[in-house]
């Protein structure tokens, strides 16, 4: 299997909510002996490998943000801990999984990584990750809503309809 990142760059104004997305691709074994551990973390573009370093997202580690289930089952983090930090990770039946970040600040800018670990009984684990950049902007040059740039081309897409401005 592989992990696809539909968008490689998200450009958002301060205060906006954004959902970063990854997609599990390829043959996914739905047998009882296979489960998937999915999580998110911040990283840096390392010289050797992107996403090798695991840093917290808003002080929450990848351990706090994980999802565990078999195949294309739906799941989400219901932890109060994540929600208190304005975060929620979720997964649907189609292999998509995401992390939603609310009320973005400039400190949220950086590289984000999704990680999938395939756990197959009595076999070695198979790890795959995807990377995407989040740029949070302020001032007159900031977009009014999040703009996303597809990984395959640099044609931008406005995602206003999906990510509403945060209200207190």
């Amino acid at each position: 299997f592989k992990v696809a990142t539909p968008y490689s760059l998200y450009v958002c104004p301060e205060g906006q909510n954004v959902t970063l997305t990854c997609r599990l691709l390829g043959p996914v074994d739905k047998g009882h002996d296979v489960t998937f551990y999915k999580t998110w973390y911040r990283s840096s573009r390392g010289e050797v490998q992107t996403c090798s370093e695991r840093r917290p997202i808003r002080n929450l580690t990848f351990q706090d943000l994980h999802l565990h289930h078999g195949g294309h089952q739906a799941a989400n983090t219901s932890h109060d801990l994540a929600q208190r930090h304005g975060l929620e990770s979720a997964s649907d039946h189609h292999g998509n999984f995401s992390i939603t970040m609310r009320n973005l600040t400039l400190l949220d800018s950086g590289l984000y990584c999704c990680l999938v670990v395939e756990i197959r009984h009595h076999h070695s684990e198979h790890r795959v990750h995807g990377a995407m950049e989040l740029q949070v902007q302020t001032g007159k040059d900031a977009p009014s809503n999040c703009v996303v740039y597809p990984s395959s081309s640099q044609e931008s897409e406005n995602i206003t309809a999906h990510h509403h401005h945060h209200h207190h």
């Epitope: 489960t35 551990y37 490998q49 090798s52 990848f62 706090d64 565990h68 756990i119 684990e125 790890r127």
Partner: antibody, heavy 118, light 107 residues
Framework: QVQLVESGGGLVKPGGSLRLSCAAS????????MSWIRQAPGKGLEWVSY????????YYADSVKGRFTISRDNAKNSLYLQMNSLRAEDTAVYYC???????????WGRGTLVTVSS | EIVLTQSPATLSLSPGERATLSCRAS??????LAWYQQKPGQAPRLLIY???NRATGIPARFSGSGSGTDFTLTISSLEPEDFAVYYC?????????FGQGTKVEIK
């Protein structure tokens, strides 16, 4: 910060049994994949057994297979290791440790000493 | 099972010196290797994960390198609290295995 505390160690005769417990503080023990690791006096570390967060799969080192049984009770935030047919070579400090997928042993208890001697 | 061989068994150095510890795997473990530090009477502590990344709170004087079968842990300038036993561990395959350890002692 979550803590792991082992208990149940002690002196037992060869062929005897012992049940070790590992109590986890915090609300997310049901998210934890766990292992038992042991260390004989003055020796190195040896992985013993693993259990996933849901209780399956379970793995054992060849040296304890058929004699040791790992289990967990998520409602009680507890991990267990039932040790039967104990041998002198099982004498060690036994640690429980978090063992998340794609990760390493990042959270350890302080250990409990098991001594197998006549 | 994958056998991890650490060398040297003991390293005698003075504070401020550079320590270089080696771990060799009997077959490739990719970069799925960690280093732990253990002091007497304490549980091991994760230092380095995935061969080259420092765990949370680990000082910059600790660094890891390598992939495949050959790995190195380097302590750039030994502090008094660094004298301990160091273990490598792989998680590329079952069973999880550790090296036999390298003791870093004060010269």
């Amino acid at each position: 910060q979550v803590q792991l505390v082992e208990s149940g160690g002690g002196l037992v005769k060869p062929g005897g049994s012992l049940r070790l417990s590992c109590a986890a503080s915090g609300e997310t023990f049901s998210d934890y994949y766990m292992s038992w690791i042991r260390q004989a006096p003055g020796k190195g570390l040896e992985w013993v057994s693993y259990i996933s967060n849901s209780g399956s799969p379970i793995y054992y080192a060849d040296s304890v297979k058929g004699r040791f049984t790992i289990s967990r009770d998520n409602a009680k935030n507890s991990l267990y290791l039932q040790m039967n047919s104990l041998r002198a070579e099982d004498t060690a400090v036994y640690y429980c440790a978090r063992d998340l997928p794609g990760w390493y042993f990042d959270l350890w208890g302080r250990g409990t000493l098991v001594t197998v001697s006549s | 099972e994958i056998v991890l061989t650490q060398s040297p068994a003991t390293l005698s150095l003075s504070p401020g010196e550079r320590a270089t510890l080696s771990c060799r795997a009997s077959q490739s473990v990719s970069s799925y290797l960690a280093w732990y530090q253990q002091k007497p009477g304490q549980a091991p502590r994760l230092l380095i994960y995935d061969a080259s990344n420092r765990a949370t709170g680990i000082p910059a004087r600790f660094s890891g390198s390598g992939s495949g079968t050959d790995f190195t842990l380097t302590i750039s300038s030994l502090e008094p609290e660094d004298f301990a036993v160091y273990y490598c561990q792989q998680r590329n395959n079952w069973p999880r295995t550790f090296g036999q350890g390298t003791k870093v002692e004060i010269k």
